[in-house]
């Protein structure tokens, strides 16, 4: 009997007192469990278990399938076991053909022997094919054959357990190894769109694609800073052996403003985790926001080109865009395009190309845009800078010399006197009167300035210059004086 300290509960005694026993097929299996607190016998082989409450286990006609571990347990939970092999020349292997192996782990080919005294218990490839060179295995008659450190390359490998019985090689039924890949990288996650803009009541639907080596990857949609379980639907595909794809679709059938926020698609496996986010913005109604890309007050020189450019955000999509000048709509000379080709783009650009502007083409240019919810517009005030033009230069009946010039910005008129025939006039003459004639007229046209000087101040022959100038340029007109005795000759104006 097992030797234990007195008073201490001891495990039961099994008779025959062997760890392992061979019984011939057809013979009786008789096992006796001796223990004052006997509870039960348990039999285990592969996935099968049986129990017996009698202290003597009797199987009258042993079959190969009675091969297995017989355990006797007492009321203290202590147990003893004996492993019985039922030797059946016709059935050398007990087989559980399901064979799954986790990559880099060991896996058991479950083909326990019914006769432990056979030789060369090993694995063989099907149809005489050799096993992979790096495949290592450890045989155990009671359990089967353990394949060490399963490789991904062993997936779908066809195997037999093999043993030599009385000089002949015997093969078990075939096994097909299915390898469950190890996670050696985090899942790859992507989202259908990075951001969503919706009006209240519209449906929000977003799809997360999770890619990994197997379907045991975990994934979920989460709302940031919220524990609420989101409703999601799944579709999945196996693209080949170690290429699994899942699509997790999150839907809010009628979005509300307070649904706005960041939604995270989270995936993890035993290697690590990955996530991707999408932003939902729900607005109560649509909007348009216009941003001028140049100053809305534009100064341009006569004959030059200018582009009036706006960027605008429009949600929902813009339906009508137009550029207007003097109540006239441009049919050409402008273009409107989305800022990006991104599906979720709400930003657009509109450009009006004004070419070789004339002084008469200054004014207010307006961009109008609308969608199903709102209208918006922006105005550009365009000023065309023109070089002064001398409209009139006359000697008036009262003896005044008068010069009228037009231009933008408002021209300044200066007067100069040149003695004799000199063309270079340096001595300035102060005007008697200066007036801006159309200051109250339309705001964008040329400004007309009139300036007068008193010719009676000139006592010698010479030339008077009227010079009109602004930021753009200058123009001059001349008056010639000739004295005959005490009388002034006719004054001849010329430019």
């Amino acid at each position: 009997q097992p030797s234990v300290s007195p008073g201490e509960p001891s495990p039961p005694s099994i008779h025959p007192a062997k760890s392992e026993l061979i019984v011939r097929v057809g013979n009786e299996i008789r096992l006796l469990c001796i223990d004052p607190g006997f509870v039960k016998w348990t039999f285990e082989i592969l996935d099968e278990t049986n129990e017996n409450k009698q202290n003597e286990w009797i199987t009258e006609k042993a079959e190969a399938t009675n091969t297995g571990k017989y355990t006797c347990t007492n009321k203290h939970g202590l147990s003893s076991s004996i492993y019985v092999f039922v030797r059946d020349p016709a059935k050398l292997f007990l087989v559980d053909r399901s064979l799954y192996g986790k990559e880099d782990n060991d896996t058991l080919v479950r083909c326990p022997l019914t006769d432990p005294e056979v030789t060369s218990y090993s694995l063989k490839g099907c149809q005489g094919k050799p096993l992979p060179k790096d495949l290592r295995f450890v045989p155990d008659p009671k359990a089967g054959i353990t394949i060490k450190s399963v490789k991904r390359a062993y997936h779908r490998l066809c195997l037999h357990c093999s043993a030599d019985q009385e000089g002949k090689s015997v093969l078990s039924d075939k096994f097909i190894l299915k390898v469950r890949p190890a996670f050696k990288a985090v899942p790859v996650v992507s989202v259908s769109k990075a951001s969503y803009l919706l009006r209240e009541g519209e449906e929000f639907t977003v799809t997360c694609t999770i890619k990994d080596v197997s379907s045991s990857v975990y994934s979920t949609w989460k709302r940031e800073n919220s524990q609420t379980k989101l409703q999601e639907k799944y579709n999945s595909w196996h693209h080949g052996d170690f290429n699994y794809e899942r699509q997790a679709t999150l839907t809010i059938s009628s979005a509300r403003v307070n649904d706005s926020g960041v939604f995270m698609c989270y995936a993890n496996n035993t290697f690590g985790s990955a996530n991707v986010t999408t932003t939902l913005e729900v607005v109560d109604k649509g909007f348009i926001n216009i941003f001028p890309m140049i100053n809305t007050t534009v100064f341009v020189n006569d004959g030059e080109n200018v582009d009036l450019i706006v960027e605008y955000e429009a949600f929902p999509k813009p339906e009508h865009q137009q550029w207007i000048y003097m109540n006239r709509t441009f049919t050409d000379k402008w273009e409107d395009y989305p800022k990006s080709e991104n599906e979720s783009n709400i930003r657009y650009v509109s450009e009006l190309h004004l070419t070789r502007l004339k002084g008469t083409e200054g004014g207010t240019y307006t961009f109008l845009v609308s969608n199903s919810d709102v209208n918006a517009s922006i105005a550009f005030n365009v000023y065309v800078n023109t070089k002064p033009e001398i409209l009139t230069y006359d000697r008036l009946v009262n003896g005044m010399l008068q010069c009228v010039a037009a231009g933008f910005p408002e021209p300044t008129i200066d007067w100069y006197f040149c003695p004799g025939t000199e063309q270079r006039c340096s001595a300035s003459v102060l005007p008697v009167d200066v007036q801006t004639l159309n200051a109250s007229g339309p705001p964008f046209g040329k400004l007309v300035v009139q300036s007068s000087i008193d010719s009676s101040a000139f006592k010698h022959n010479g030339t008077v210059e009227c010079k009109a100038y602004n930021d753009v340029g200058k123009t001059s007109a001349y008056f010639n004086f000739a004295f005959k005795g005490n009388n002034k000759e006719q004054i001849h104006p010329h430019t």
């Epitope: 030797s3 025959p16 062997k18 026993l21 061979i22 011939r24 013979n27 299996i29 008789r30 009797i58």
Partner: antibody, heavy 121, light 107 residues
Framework: EVQLVESGGGLVQPGGSLRLSCAAS????????MDWVRQAPGKGLEWVGR??????????EYAASVKGRFTISRDDSKNSLYLQMNSLKTEDTAVYYC????????????WGRGTLVTVSS | DIQMTQSPSSLSASVGDRVTITCRAS??????LNWYQQKPGKAPKLLIY???SLQSGVPSRFSGSGSGTDFTLTISSLQPEDFATYYC?????????FGGGTKVEIK
């Protein structure tokens, strides 16, 4: 060669002690449960006791006639089996055989030649 | 303890005879029964184990049968080297008791 060789027998007075040894060779000693069987002069065979192997946790079992006086032990590193006999009685006089059990049954498939133990004053 | 009763305790037979020795157990021992042959001055030798399995190297004229409590050893054609003492032994429950032996002598 597969064999068992007993040693340590001899003449001993009643109440004395003796230690028998059994040297195993030619097989994997650690795999086997081992027994002692004795045979008094002109009598039949009597099982004395046994020791299990490591798989059987080296458990020992004894015949009622020797329990408490005899101790069986083994040293797997030396491929040796021992029988320590204390408080010897005249009725312990016998040829003592060392015997091997096969791995998967209880029988004695290999025997030593035996060693004679005589308990006499 | 399980008692093993062997009969006859001795028998005389001639070469070529069919010899039968019986062994009875005091309780059912299933097939846990072994047969040994012992010649004078020699160690016993295993002939049959598990009631009917012939030990490797043993001539096929030896056979065993029985299960439960009654067992038989048969020598189909006695040979000169078969004159010896034969023992049965139960290996179900310790102590592993032997029968008293059957001595097979030359007639």
């Amino acid at each position: 060669e597969v064999q068992l060789v007993e040693s340590g027998g001899g003449l001993v007075q009643p109440g004395g002690s003796l230690r028998l040894s059994c040297a195993a060779s030619g097989f994997t000693f650690v795999d086997h449960d081992m027994d002692w069987v004795r045979q008094a002069p002109g009598k039949g065979l009597e099982w004395v006791g046994r020791t299990r192997n490591k798989l059987g946790s080296y458990t020992t079992e004894y015949a009622a006639s020797v329990k408490g006086r005899f101790t069986i032990s083994r040293d797997d590193s030396k491929n040796s089996l021992y029988l320590q006999m204390n408080s010897l009685k005249t009725e312990d006089t016998a040829v003592y055989y060392c015997a091997r059990e096969p791995k998967y049954w209880i029988d004695f498939d290999l025997w030593g030649r035996g060693t004679l133990v005589t308990v006499s004053s | 303890d399980i008692q093993m009763t062997q009969s006859p305790s001795s028998l005389s037979a001639s070469v070529g005879d069919r010899v039968t020795i019986t062994c009875r157990a005091s309780q059912s021992i299933s097939s846990y029964l072994n047969w040994y042959q012992q010649k004078p001055g020699k160690a016993p030798k295993l002939l049959i184990y598990a009631a009917s399995s012939l030990q490797s190297g043993v001539p096929s004229r030896f056979s065993g049968s029985g299960s439960g409590t009654d067992f038989t050893l048969t020598i189909s054609s006695l040979q000169p080297e078969d004159f010896a003492t034969y023992y049965c032994q139960q290996s179900y429950i310790a102590p592993y008791t032997f029968g008293g032996g059957t001595k097979v002598e030359i007639k």
